[in-house]
């Protein structure tokens, strides 16, 4: 058959939850301390909460069924009677009472024909302001007749026909009734919620609703123009040209900021936005949702997209509607012919209307922003240059911030890219130019996106001119090739000698993408003597083992995820893992990760890695490779300092010569 509607699916779930109590029993969730009841979907069932309020489960007959004394559940279908009597069956006795008062309407409800009645519950009538109720029942009851006819449709309409955004023609002057059928199974009629649906009658169907509904006459734009509280909004809409859309056809939700909402914004920010047509348009579009969203539809947090493209979290807390967790809606469900308005008393400024400074204020990067300010780079963060700011998280500076000297200033300039980027368009191997003149490389991994050693830690915030990338560490631009890095660090003197002996110097000096796991001098010294001698005594073996320390792509620690198998130049794969922020290679911890080079990255290790297939080498002739001899001397374990090793005299002389 046809796909079930959300309402029917929720009803089916409630029926499922109630079936252990007998046939046609539905589980209903009642919000504690109120009379609000809901058929329950899966999520609500397990959370036992609606709008953050606890619920109790009760079991009732599903719509259309009743109990039979002495039998389990609700085995009997309700007897069909006319619409008037069915109002009593669903508990809408006040509607019956007012129907009687009109004189004309009861005969219609009891007579031939086919009608749909959206019948307000007794509580709905009782909650009407006294003056409204008085006006309905005076004037020879004509207003009451009109109000009741507005709740009626001249044909049978069941919930499976109630589609989201449709309009029904009422029996009062053919005025429209707005129907919304939400994915969570809630159905609203002019924003009144369907409480009990599809109660069949001989001459139609009754749906019980939680409010008395009234005709809708104005569009959104007209409401803005009428209300004094929207004076600033009115001016902003006029300036942006959005009035055409807001008076046209469609179904929108306007989260309408009151004058008070605009007053809360610093005048400098407000004037900047109001004076910038694009920022203003984005600001207003951020208050408009693409479809009508009634307050009754919200029973839990819901992500909605604004016309500007930002996602808002609309939720509720008891009777209050919230946006992004804040109860800023002061008046809800003001119906317009083209949607619904909720008054809000805080402005929702989208990122697209903000400066980099403003973006950063809401991110966890305040320490970095202070550094940029102190370094005299503030004008770049508030101006109209197209830039991308790479701002490290506050946690990066937990051990303190660097002094603002020339080096720091330069480092910070290399955290500002000369273009407004979006991370979704970045690609592996792309180079980005900084204000400091450096070229930074982009590395795209399965679960992360990194720029040099620093990876993006949060979604981009794309501002009016600048984009903020929140980074997981201070970015260090490369200062030379891998070989330059190793030569410039005395921890690697033995590795450098080994690389030279193995003929790998050129490889690590040329353009390329390498990940080098660099054993320190201590790592070489820590080798058992036998392994050390095997390494030093065979140039082929040495090259083989060194190549096993070189991955054939750039892998920074932020790109590791849980486990990466990195192919080495030797052919075997290296198992690189990240656990509790510690990088390991072949289960051995890396002492210092991410020393960037122009042709790769160096990770410092304190052990020499052994390839899995490192079988004992066949005996070969004694090598006459002079580079190897030099390495053997350099490695006499760079130990003029290590007292228990002494070079044979002939080589001691050679070393002396090499020193001069």
């Amino acid at each position: 058959g046809p796909a079930k509607s959300p309402y029917q699916l929720v009803l089916q779930h409630s029926r499922l939850r109630g079936r252990q109590h007998g046939p046609n029993v539905c589980a209903v969730q009642k919000v504690i301390g109120t009379n609000r009841k809901y058929f329950t979907n899966c999520k609500q069932w397990y959370q036992r909460k609606i709008c953050g309020k606890s619920t109790v489960i009760s079991y009732e007959c599903c719509p259309g069924y009743e109990k039979v004394p002495g039998e389990k559940g609700c085995p009997a279908a309700l007897p069909l009677s006319n619409l008037y009597e069915t109002l009593g069956v669903v508990g809408s006795t006040t509607t019956q009472l007012y129907t009687d008062r009109t004189e004309k309407l009861r005969p219609e409800m009891e007579g031939p024909g086919s009608f749909t009645i959206f019948a307000p519950s007794n509580e709905a009538w009782a909650s009407l302001p006294a003056e409204v109720l008085d006006s309905l029942v005076s004037n020879v009851n004509i207003e009451l007749l009109n109000a009741l006819r507005y709740h009626m449709v001249g044909r049978r309409v069941l919930t499976d026909e109630l589609k989201h955004g449709m309009t029904l023609t009422s029996m009062y002057q053919n005025s429209n009734i707005q129907i919304h059928h939400y994915p969570n199974g809630i159905v609203t009629v002019n924003c009144a919620r369907l409480l009990k649906a599809d109660h069949h009658a001989t001459n139609g169907v009754v749906h019980l609703i939680d409010k008395v509904i009234s005709t809708i006459t104005n569009n959104i734009q007209q409401i803005i123009e009428i209300e004094d509280t929207f004076e600033t909004l009115r001016a902003a809409v006029a300036a942006s040209g959005l009035n055409t859309m807001l008076e046209g056809n469609g179904q929108y939700t306007l989260l309408a900021p009151t004058n008070e909402a605009f007053e809360k914004i610093p005048s400098e920010t407000l004037n900047r936005i109001l004076g910038d047509p694009e920022a203003l348009r984005d600001l207003l579009n951020n208050h408009i949702l693409k479809s009508a969203m009634c307050a009754e539809a919200i029973v839990a947090g819901l992500s909605v997209e604004t016309l500007e493209g930002t996602t808002l979290e609309v939720g509720c807390s008891g009777d209050m509607l919230t946006i992004n967790g804040k109860a800023i809606i002061s008046n809800k469900d003001i119906l317009a012919t083209n949607g619904v308005i909720h008054y809000i008393d805080e402005l929702l400024i989208p990122d697209s209307a903000k400066t980099l400074f403003e973006l950063a204020a809401e991110s966890d990067v305040s320490t970095a922003i202070d550094l940029f300010r102190q370094a005299g780079l503030g004008n770049h963060l508030s101006g109209s240059e197209r830039l991308t700011l790479l701002a490290p998280l506050n946690s990066v500076f937990k051990d303190g911030t660097p002094p603002i000297d020339a080096h720091t200033r330069n480092l910070l300039r290399n955290h500002i890219i000369k273009d407004q980027l979006a991370s979704k368009y970045l690609y592996h191997g792309q180079t980005l130019e900084t204000l400091g003149g450096k070229k930074l490389r982009v590395f795209v991994y399965r679960n992360s996106l990194c720029i040099e050693n620093s990876c993006i830690a949060a979604h981009d915030k794309r501002g009016r001119y600048g984009t903020l990338f929140t980074m997981d560490r201070v970015l260090t631009p490369p200062m030379g090739t891998v070989m330059d890095v190793l030569k410039g660090d005395n921890r690697f003197s033995m590795l450098v000698a080994a690389i030279q002996s193995a003929g790998l110097t050129e490889t690590l000096n040329r353009e390329g993408v390498y990940t080098v796991f660099a054993p320190t001098n201590e790592a070489f010294r820590a080798l058992p003597p036998r392994e050390r001698s095997r390494l030093l005594g065979d140039a082929k073996e040495l090259a083989n083992i060194l190549k096993y320390h070189i991955g054939d792509e750039i892998l920074v620690s932020g790109g590791i995820g849980a486990l990466v198998r990195l192919k080495s130049l030797q052919g075997d794969k290296l198992e690189v893992s990240l656990k509790n922020n510690v990088v390991s290679v072949n289960k051995e911890p890396v002492a210092e990760p991410d020393i960037m080079a122009t042709n790769g990255v160096v990770h410092v290790i304190t052990n020499v890695l052994q390839p899995p297939a490192n079988r004992p080498q066949e005996r070969g002739d004694e090598l006459a490779d002079s580079a190897l001899e030099i390495f053997k001397q350099a490695s006499a374990f760079s130990r003029a300092s290590q007292r228990s090793v002494r070079l044979a005299p002939v080589y001691q002389k050679l070393l002396e010569r090499m020193k001069h």
Epitope: N614, R646, V650
Partner: antibody
Framework: QVQLVQSGAEVKKPGSSVKVSCKAS????????MYWVRQAPGQGLEWVGT????????YYAQKVQGRFTITRDSSTSTLYLELSSLRSEDTAVYYC?????????????WGQGTTVTVSS | DIVMTQSPDSLAVSLGERATMNCKSS????????????LAWYQQKPGQPPKLLIY???TRESGVPDRFSGSGSGTDFTLTISSLQAEDVAVYYC?????????FGQGTKLEIK
């Protein structure tokens, strides 16, 4: 078969020097690490020093560092241990030992030993 | 330095019986990269140089009778002679070649009961 023939016994005074030799045969001398191990009278074994297959570097026990020198001569397949600044505690049988292969390893083949006595 | 400690210092076993001696190192001799234990066992008979019996803690040197076996890993090692023969009377030494300086145990003297 592998043979390591060591020079004869030596009696020396404290502070003097002596050079002990070990002539190898039955294998390619330059393909092996070589070692000296000593054993004081009634005592256990003590490693003295190592020389690599090509004679490029030598390792020494702390006790003898700076006083003893190990050298090798591939042309004559001979290993040497020069003991200088002798002390009475250097009295021991000195064994010339061949490693397992061309890499630093365990002590595979032993010479018959040379007794060095240091006494005033 | 790695300290090697053998136990017992001396051992008397009847001919044909099993003889077991232990060797403990002050730090692990297992090299994780190749999962090998850098330990050897030697036999020294009176007036003779020592003779290699076992290397890699459990690999028997060629020509060594199969009644000799080595076991253990990390810091605890054992040399076992499954059925003692008269010619097995000697002092047995363990030795580590995991780190310089290479060190020996003090020896276990094996006698016939």
């Amino acid at each position: 078969q592998v043979q390591l023939v060591q020079s004869g016994a030596e009696v020396k005074k404290p502070g003097s020097s002596v050079k002990v030799s070990c002539k190898a045969s039955g294998f390619t001398f330059s393909d092996y690490y070589m070692y000296w191990v000593r054993q004081a009278p009634g005592q256990g074994l003590e490693w003295v020093g190592t020389i690599s297959d090509g004679g490029i570097y030598a390792y020494y026990a702390q006790k003898v560092q700076g006083r003893f020198t190990i050298t090798r001569d591939s042309s004559t397949s001979t290993l040497y241990l020069e003991l200088s600044s002798l002390r009475s505690e250097d009295t021991a049988v000195y064994y010339c030992v061949r490693g397992w292969d061309r890499y630093d390893s365990w002590f595979a083949c032993w010479g018959q030993g040379t007794t060095v006595t240091v006494s005033s | 330095d790695i300290v090697m400690t053998q136990s017992p210092d001396s051992l008397a076993v009847s001919l044909g019986e099993r003889a077991t001696m232990n060797c403990k190192s002050s730090q692990s001799l297992l090299y994780s990269s190749n999962q090998k234990n850098y330990l050897a066992w030697y036999q020294q008979k009176p007036g003779q140089p020592p003779k290699l019996l076992i290397y890699w803690a459990s690999t028997r040197e060629s020509g060594v009778p199969d009644r000799f076996s080595g076991s253990g890993s990390g810091t605890d090692f054992t040399l076992t002679i499954s059925s003692l023969q008269a010619e097995d009377v000697a002092v047995y030494y363990c030795q580590q070649y995991y780190r310089y300086p290479y060190t020996f145990g003090q020896g276990t003297k094996l006698e016939i009961k």
